[in-house]
């Protein structure tokens, strides 16, 4: 009996036309939502004038439906048993699941000012920037609507730059009508233990953002894993959102709508400094902000963001070193709300429920030539927002799963 079940599972998790896995893989049957909490700055003038701690108050959730579009350009390669695809991006605002509208205003760091002052280190250039910043009446902080902050707005300072430059700025700009990839993943036809594992991303096996093993594209995209998952496994996956591969470890058995699943979590060790976790040495890219690689819990992804000083962390700087959160008041990290987990059905390897949580931060540094940054006496890694992307298998799909998969085993 068990052998027959194994054979059936192996057949059905292959990523090719006609299998259960393929149908759900091309277009997820799960409704996926992305909730945003924006960090509204309460004391912008004090920070700019006196280099005070930044007082933030989170506002949210503002919820969008995401990942509702089917994979595009799905192409099988019989030679190397892979399938390639693009994952299109789309977001639809869900007012009924939100605390306000997309027109709600927030006081946030001026993204263009912070980024330009970081990228253009040259003092004379900073003097030119300063005159453009002043001329455009820009400051260290700005008031923006949710829609502007997420999806893009025309920046007044950048609009004065007399060179070819993208004047639209937004944390997720451009998003709608774009796609992530091309991904090329193993379809599992020749070897089921490789199913869904990424072979190449954007035509490469490495990212070119990091040194050594940190640069590798490991595992799947976390939507599924090869079947027959063991609790002892370390599940590797790649997340383009954070420009790196990461891993999850078993935490507990969970019952999800009558389906036994394994809860895998991202451990604090994955965010540790190289002092505590030597494997992380290659995620430390500079010595000053990282205090000689002793800081932890923030990931500098500037190389992946055209030099913009973007730092990724867990929400509220969960698992981050005290020096990171010290200049920010109003944060309350807790594991239950702010960690990432994957609930995986072990027989098929399918992720039936997940919560992906991350925080987007921007570095802002003092600049003696830029008036609005002149009074700063320290560097700040400023939280802009955090997000919670969740998906849970629907009741109908869960019934089908129970009857066709877990029910047959038990």
């Amino acid at each position: 009996g068990d052998l027959l079940i194994q054979k059936t599972i192996k057949k059905q998790v292959v990523l090719e036309e006609g299998t259960i896995a393929f149908k759900n893989w091309v277009k997820t049957g799960t409704e996926v939502y992305r909730q945003f909490w924006i960090f509204d700055v309460q004391n912008p003038q004090e920070v700019m004038m006196n280099s005070s701690n930044i007082q933030v108050k989170q506002r949210g959730p503002y919820t969008y439906r995401v990942r509702f579009l089917a994979k595009e350009n799905v192409t099988q390669d019989a030679e190397d048993n892979t399938v390639s695809f693009l994952q299109p991006n789309g977001a639809i605002f869900e007012p009924s699941l939100s605390v306000g509208t997309e027109a709600d205003n927030f006081t946030v760091l001026n993204l263009a000012v912070a980024a330009a002052s970081h990228i253009y280190q040259n003092q004379f250039v900073q003097m030119i920037l300063n005159s453009l910043i002043n001329k455009s009446k820009s400051s260290m902080f700005q008031v923006r609507t949710l829609r502007e902050l997420l999806w893009g707005y025309r920046d007044p300072f950048l609009s004065l730059v007399p060179y070819p430059v993208t004047t639209t700025v937004g944390l997720f700009y451009p998003y709608n009508n774009t796609a992530d990839g091309v991904y090329k993943v193993f379809n599992g036809k020749d070897n089921i233990s490789k199913v869904a594992i990424i072979d190449t991303y954007k035509g490469k096996r490495n990212l070119s953002y990091w040194e050594s093993h940190c640069d590798m594209i490991n595992g799947t995209d976390a939507a599924s894993f090869p079947p027959f998952v063991e609790k002892s496994q370390v599940l590797q996956f790649f997340s383009s959102d954070i420009c790196r591969s990461i891993y999850a470890v078993f935490e507990s058995d969970v019952n999800l709508k009558g389906i036994p699943v394994y809860r895998f979590v991202l451990p604090s060790k994955a965010f540790a400094s190289p002092v505590e976790n030597p494997d992380n040495y290659c995620f430390c890219t500079e010595k000053i902000i990282s205090k000689n690689c002793t800081s932890y819990g923030v990931l500098d992804i500037s190389k992946c963001k055209e030099g913009r000083p973007v730092y990724i962390s867990l929400p509220h700087f969960l698992y981050a070193s005290p020096d990171v959160s010290e200049p920010i008041d109003g944060l309350n990290p807790n594991e239950e709300e702010h960690r990432t987990y994957l609930d995986i059905e072990p027989i098929t390897g399918f992720t039936l429920q997940f919560a992906k949580r991350l925080q987007v931060n921007l570095l802002v540094k003092p600049s003696e030539k830029i008036q609005v940054l002149k009074n700063l006496k320290r560097n700040y890694i400023v939280p802009i927002l955090w997000l919670n992307e969740t998906g849970t298998i629907g009741d109908e799909k869960a019934n089908m799963f129970r009857s066709q998969v877990t029910g047959k085993i038990n």
Epitope: A116, I119, Y120, Q121, N122, Q123, F124, V125, I128, L129, L158, V161, P162, Y163, P164, V165, T166, S302, K303, E306, G307
Partner: nanobody, 126 residues
């Protein structure tokens, strides 16, 4: 990789003139803003004059009316014409360059956006 090569320094009497040159090699986007700095013994390096590719110029108050910065975009070279030199102008003069805000900066120049020459000595005797 950007390289800056200065020339034209030397010993001159007070009231005399010198013309410094700085030739930049590498992508012109990476050196669109060019400037001259100087550092006198025991003092901090200070910005003397700067010029952007669009012609925006800056002069330190101490050199206004005496020094003129200019550039030849075709040769990717910047010049500093120094007239009515004073003993307090004695210093090592450094050529400096960097990109201005431009979409292709990170792709073409990488993470470094501040480039320096080796320096040329200017000595003004009284």
């Amino acid at each position: 990789q950007v390289q800056l090569q200065e020339s034209g320094g030397g010993l001159v009497q007070a009231g005399g003139s010198l013309r410094l040159s700085c030739a930049a090699s590498g992508d012109t986007i990476c050196t669109s803003a060019m400037a001259w700095y100087r550092q006198a013994p025991g003092k901090e390096r200070e910005l003397v004059a700067g010029i952007s590719s669009g012609g925006t110029v800056y002069y330190a108050d101490s050199v206004k009316g005496r020094f003129t910065i200019s550039r030849d975009n075709a040769k990717n070279t910047v010049y500093l014409q120094m007239n009515t030199l004073k003993p307090e102008d004695t210093a090592v003069y450094y050529c400096n360059a960097g990109p201005e805000v431009h979409d292709d900066v990170f792709r073409l120049c990488g993470p470094t956006t501040d480039y320096w020459g080796q320096g040329t000595q200017v000595t003004v005797s009284s």
